[in-house]
């Protein structure tokens, strides 16, 4: 049975969508900035009709590896999923590898496509640049995600976000629209535009199919 809760906001995305939040856990974001990033993710989640039938979410913090806090198949109340998202720990790592997290998204999160009717989106929140040695297979992973029809939306935050990688992602598919922000302070201003963009990429649920009419028996 679907675990639903009443909407918290006027705008509420009720579409068929698998959405993955990928949070940069590098020290390029201070602990305070990471708090703002988490608040943004939770705010976004409040505007989605989260359930196994409508919008499924995953939340991953990435540094030199990836740490999944929520999986797409987690059957929990939306409020509990938001609580878990708010508990994402600040890693403050030297490195946050976008290549590694896209590889994780490709081979772990979207290894099997169990909802072909839903749109698949990875929201890549990035504030840093991985070392070149780590980015050798970056394009391959972006292309792999494209093959699986996973849209990648990069959100560059602050002066250290890897603009070269953002442009590479954008080049792979027209839907891969980037949002480039000068700081985390702009996340709240851009939130509704980002949610609207994601929501518009996802299909509405088809109307329920009615059983065929029973043959009328006339006496």
């Amino acid at each position: 049975e679907d675990i639903s809760e009443p909407p918290l906001h006027d705008f509420y995305c009720s579409r068929l969508l698998d959405l993955v939040f990928l949070l940069d856990g590098s020290s390029r974001l201070s602990e305070a900035e990471f708090e703002v990033l988490k608040a943004f993710v939770v705010d976004m989640m409040e505007r989605l009709r989260i359930s196994q039938k409508w919008v499924r979410v995953a939340v991953v913090e990435y540094h030199d590896g990836s740490h999944a806090y929520i999986g797409l198949k987690d059957r929990k109340r939306p409020s509990e999923l938001r609580r878990i998202a708010s508990q994402v720990k600040y890693a403050g790592s030297q490195v946050a590898s976008t290549s590694e997290v896209l590889k994780y998204t490709l081979f772990q999160i979207f290894s099997k496509i169990d909802r072909p009717e839903a749109s698949r989106i990875a929201l890549l929140l990035m504030a840093s640049q991985e070392p070149q040695r780590m980015s050798r297979n970056f394009v391959r992973y972006v292309q792999g995600l494209k093959k699986k029809k996973v849209i990648v939306i990069p959100v560059g935050i602050g002066p250290h976000a890897n603009l070269k990688q953002i442009r590479l992602i954008e080049k792979q598919a027209p839907e891969n629209k980037a949002f480039v922000l000068s700081s985390v302070d702009e996340l709240e201003q851009q939130r509704d535009e980002i949610v609207s963009y994601l929501c518009d990429l996802a299909p509405e649920a088809p109307p329920p199919t009615l059983p065929p009419h029973m043959a009328q028996v006339t006496v």
Epitope: S27, S30, E31, A32, E33, E35, V36, K38, A39, V42, S86, Q87, V88, K89, Y90, G92
Partner: nanobody, 126 residues
Framework: QVQLQESGGGLVQAGASLRLSCAAS????????MAWFRQAPGKEREFVVF???????LYSTSVRGRFTISRDNAKNTVYLQMMNLKPEDTAVYYC????????????????????WGQGTQVTVSS
């Protein structure tokens, strides 16, 4: 178990300054994100300011530019320098700490903090 003790409150005129202190007992203080909240009479407790273990800060819009938070890990103390005080700043000010080893949360929510002080009263008269 961490104990927090606020001090420095009092009665001042509008436009004056005050410095609140929050002394913490217990180990690992330097790794704890800290915050100040306040509760005005008849109102709910509200977030004022946050300071991370890395000294990074977040301010509520109502105090930005007037209040400054800092921490001295050697003294296990967090300070709140309040300038250009207004009558609407009148409240009980609470210090809060989060044990980041096993808890996290959203910085402006009370439920994100594990330890609380008893509060210190700040009254600003016009």
């Amino acid at each position: 178990q961490v104990q927090l003790q606020e001090s420095g409150g009092g009665l001042v005129q509008a436009g004056a300054s005050l410095r609140l202190s929050c002394a913490a007992s217990g180990r690992s203080f330097s790794s704890y994100p800290m915050a100040w909240f306040r509760q005005a009479p008849g109102k709910e407790r509200e977030f004022v300011v946050f300071i991370g273990s890395d000294h990074s800060t977040l301010y509520s819009t109502s105090v930005r530019g007037r209040f400054t938070i800092s921490r001295d890990n050697a003294k296990n103390t967090v300070y709140l320098q309040m300038m250009n005080l207004k009558p609407e700043d009148t409240a009980v000010y609470y210090c809060a700490a989060r044990n980041s080893a096993w808890s996290s949360g959203i910085y402006y929510r009370e439920t994100s903090y594990d330890y609380w002080g008893q509060g210190t009263q700040v009254t600003v008269s016009s």
